[in-house]
Each structure stands twice: as structure tokens, then as C-alpha cells.
Interface confidence: low
């Protein structure tokens, strides 16, 4: 996958779009995760509704929202009140049962607000972390549950 760059201005909202083949990814939930280095795990930020049919409903985790147009095949992520520490590598993922398929690799760049004279050195890029076995394997992180979200679907 090539990396697509999305630029936003600090303090404003940034919309990231990830197009996909709606037939190939039919029935699959989607997720937005943050890549910890080129070979590091991708830490989940937010995922679409537990019920795939309700994927169009916007879900928030902190200042990040996700919504999925499953017919049109476009996943949209909104980063509200963009901050320098939001800069870095991300992935749009399709949660394909036993794996997470990468839909798009995204580099988020945060441009300084022209009205804000903070040092541009505040921009943060993730460093390398230890490599892991397979880039397609979905990695989980502990996170607070969103309203109405069950911890896990049934386990078998």
C-alpha cells in the first residue's frame, strides 16, 4: 500500500477518506488505527458500529469519529480539533474476521495555525517499535468502551 498524505491545520477538523471495494468488504466492520513505526503494531483508535448495518452511524472516541458508507464503499474519519500530537502514520482497516485488512495507509500532517506562533518542533512522529509477525494481524489495545458498546462479540 502506498501512503496517502492528509494535511490539516492545528485547531481545525481534518477529514480522512478511505475508499474500498464494497463487495470485497461486505459485512465487515472498519477501524482507524495508529501505526507505531513502520513494522510496529497498529493501535486501534476507533471502530465502526458493532452492528454492520448501523455502520453509517458516526462513532466517536475522544476527538476522533468514524462513519462508513457501506454501499458507496467509503470510510470517513474525522479528527476534530487537530493537534500536533495527532501527526503520524495511521491505517484504515477492514476487520475481516480473522485479520484486519489494510484499506489505506495514511500520513496525517498537522500544519501550524497561521495565527498560532508555537514552535513547529512540537510536531510528533512515532518512533520505531519492535517488529511483529504479520502486518495483517489485528492488534488490540485497552481502551474505554464507547456508550452502548459491548466489550466483545460472542467468542465462538
Amino acid at each position: 500500500h502506498n501512503t496517502t498524505v492528509f494535511q490539516g491545520v492545528a485547531g481545525q477538523s481534518l477529514q480522512v477518506s478511505c475508499p474500498y471495494d464494497s463487495m470485497k468488504h461486505w459485512g465487515r466492520r472498519k477501524a482507524w488505527c495508529r501505526q507505531l513505526g513502520e513494522k510496529g503494531p497498529c493501535q486501534r483508535v476507533v471502530s465502526t458500529h458493532n452492528l454492520w448495518l448501523l455502520s453509517f452511524l458516526r462513532r466517536w472516541n475522544g476527538s476522533t469519529a468514524i462513519t462508513d458508507d457501506t454501499l458507496g464503499g467509503t470510510l470517513t474519519i474525522t479528527l476534530r480539533n487537530l493537534q500536533p500530537h495527532d501527526a503520524g502514520l495511521y491505517q484504515c482497516q477492514s476487520l475481516a474476521g480473522s485479520e484486519a485488512d489494510t484499506l489505506r495507509k495514511v500520513l496525517v500532517e498537522v500544519l501550524a495555525d497561521p495565527l498560532d506562533h508555537r514552535d513547529a518542533g512540537d510536531l510528533w512522529f512515532p518512533g520505531e517499535s519492535e517488529s511483529f509477525e504479520d502486518a495483517h494481524v489485528e492488534h488490540s489495545i485497552s481502551r474505554s468502551l464507547l456508550e452502548g458498546e459491548i466489550p466483545f462479540p460472542p467468542t465462538s
Epitope: D21, S98, E99, E133, E138, S140
Partner: antibody, heavy 123, light 112 residues
Framework: QVQLQQSGPELVKPGASLKISCKAS????????MNWVKQRPGKGLEWIGR????????NYNGEFRVRATLTADTSSTTAYMQLSSLTSEDSAVYFC????????????????WGQGASVTVSS | DVVMTQTPLSLPVSLGDQASISCRSS???????????LHWYLQKPGQSPKLLIY???NRFSGVPDRFSGSGSGTDFTLKISRVEADDLGVYFC?????????FGGGTKLEIK
């Protein structure tokens, strides 16, 4: 009904290449992953890799990545596996197998298998 | 890679008896989405493998309810409540939680 028809037995010389076919029918070929599995005589099963015919996306088992190439032709609904630089260790039965998609909660098991293609590598 | 270990290697049974096959994985098969991708296949002599059980305990269509799967994490079991002659063959467990997919070494069910 779902059917996977594989090509016939092959006798090939060491160092040669080989292409096995798997003709699919009875389901949406383009939108189901196709797996390839190796079974040596009297031995267990080894996953070689898989291909998504709709866009040619592939995943390989590391030890097969160098010498195995998976392709698919959607117009003829046929999947292919090419093996190069064959040795006696490649003498085996090779199966193609469709990945079950129990949508929307996909199960990722292999529900339909071809009859197997027997390959003998010998000089 | 995830290593799948099956026991026993060979299982002699009398027709009508219960049979139990164990499968252990080298790491947890619980995917981060909460599902467990552990499946069971039966391969009869001269045939290709056939899917029996998917995702630990779900019987595939046409599979008799004499077959049941259970387990979690790294330990799984396939039980056949009343063995019939048609059940003889080699049983394989397999995981598809992680790539590459891997199989157990197989358990041969045979008549005592």
C-alpha cells in the same frame, strides 16, 4: 452447488516449474478467498497461501513465498498455483479450498475443497 | 507461527463409543475482535478434507449433531458421541486467527 475441480496428476523433473489449476463453479468466485494447501504422503496439512480473485490480493506462508505464485482468472473462474525450482520435497497432493464467509460474521474456515492434484517430482 | 498440537495421534474406538480428540495451540487463538478461529476437519482415506466444525463449536451444514466442539484460548476438544463406521479417518484441527493458517498433525480414528 459449489464445486472445485483441480487439474490432473503431474510427474515433473527436479528444478522444473509446474502450474496447477482449480476451476470453481457454483458461487461468486471473485468475492471469496481461495486457499492452497499442501499434503505430503502420510503427512499433515500445510497452508501455502490464499488469493482474493476480485483484485489479486495474496497472502503467503513464509516458507512458500519465494517459490509459489498464486493467480486467478475471473473470466474463467479459475485459480492457479505455480511452483518453481521443484525438489523431491514438493512431491505432494495440493488442494485448493474456498474460504467460508459466513457474513457478516465471517468464519474463515475452508468449507469446500478440490479433489487434490497429485505432484511427483522425480528424475 | 502458531503451532497446533493434537493428541492422541491414533484413537482406536469401538463403534457406538464416544471419542474425544484434543488440540492445543502454542498461543491463544482468541482474536482481538473476541472471536476464536479454531476449526475441525475430517479427511477420509483417498479424499480431500471436509469441514466439520468452525469457530470452536459451530457445526457446518450437514454435519450430524453427534459431533461437538468446545474449548477456549489454547485448549480445544472435538467429541463424537456415538462413533459410526462413516466417522473413521484423520481429524485435523486448524487455526485461522493468525497468518499463516496452521493445522494440527492429525488424529487417526480407527476401529479397535
Amino acid at each position: 452447488q459449489v464445486q472445485l475441480q483441480q487439474s490432473g496428476p503431474e510427474l515433473v523433473k527436479p528444478g522444473a516449474s509446474l502450474k496447477i489449476s482449480c476451476k470453481a463453479s457454483g458461487y461468486a468466485f471473485s468475492s471469496s478467498w481461495m486457499n492452497w494447501v499442501k499434503q505430503r504422503p502420510g503427512k499433515g496439512l500445510e497452508w501455502i497461501g490464499r488469493i482474493y480473485p476480485g483484485d489479486g490480493d495474496t497472502n503467503y506462508n513464509g516458507e512458500f513465498r519465494v517459490r509459489a505464485t498464486l493467480t486467478a482468472d475471473t473470466s474463467s473462474t479459475t485459480a492457479y498455483m505455480q511452483l518453481s525450482s521443484l525438489t523431491s520435497e514438493d512431491s505432494a497432493v495440493y488442494f485448493c479450498a474456498r474460504l467460508l464467509r459466513n457474513q457478516p460474521g465471517e468464519s474463515y474456515a475452508m468449507d469446500y475443497w478440490g479433489q487434490g492434484a497429485s505432484v511427483t517430482v522425480s528424475s | 507461527d502458531v503451532v497446533m498440537t493434537q493428541t492422541p495421534l491414533s484413537l482406536p474406538v469401538s463403534l457406538g463409543d464416544q471419542a474425544s480428540i484434543s488440540c492445543r495451540s502454542s498461543q491463544s487463538l482468541v482474536h482481538s475482535n473476541g472471536y476464536t478461529y479454531l476449526h475441525w476437519y475430517l479427511q477420509k482415506p483417498g479424499q480431500s478434507p471436509k469441514l466439520l466444525i468452525y469457530k470452536v463449536s459451530n457445526r457446518f451444514s450437514g454435519v450430524p449433531d453427534r459431533f461437538s466442539g468446545s474449548g477456549s484460548g489454547t485448549d480445544f476438544t472435538l467429541k463424537i458421541s456415538r462413533v459410526e463406521a462413516d466417522d473413521l479417518g484423520v481429524y485435523f484441527c486448524s487455526q485461522s486467527t493468525r497468518v499463516p493458517y496452521t493445522f494440527g498433525g492429525g488424529t487417526k480414528l480407527e476401529i479397535k
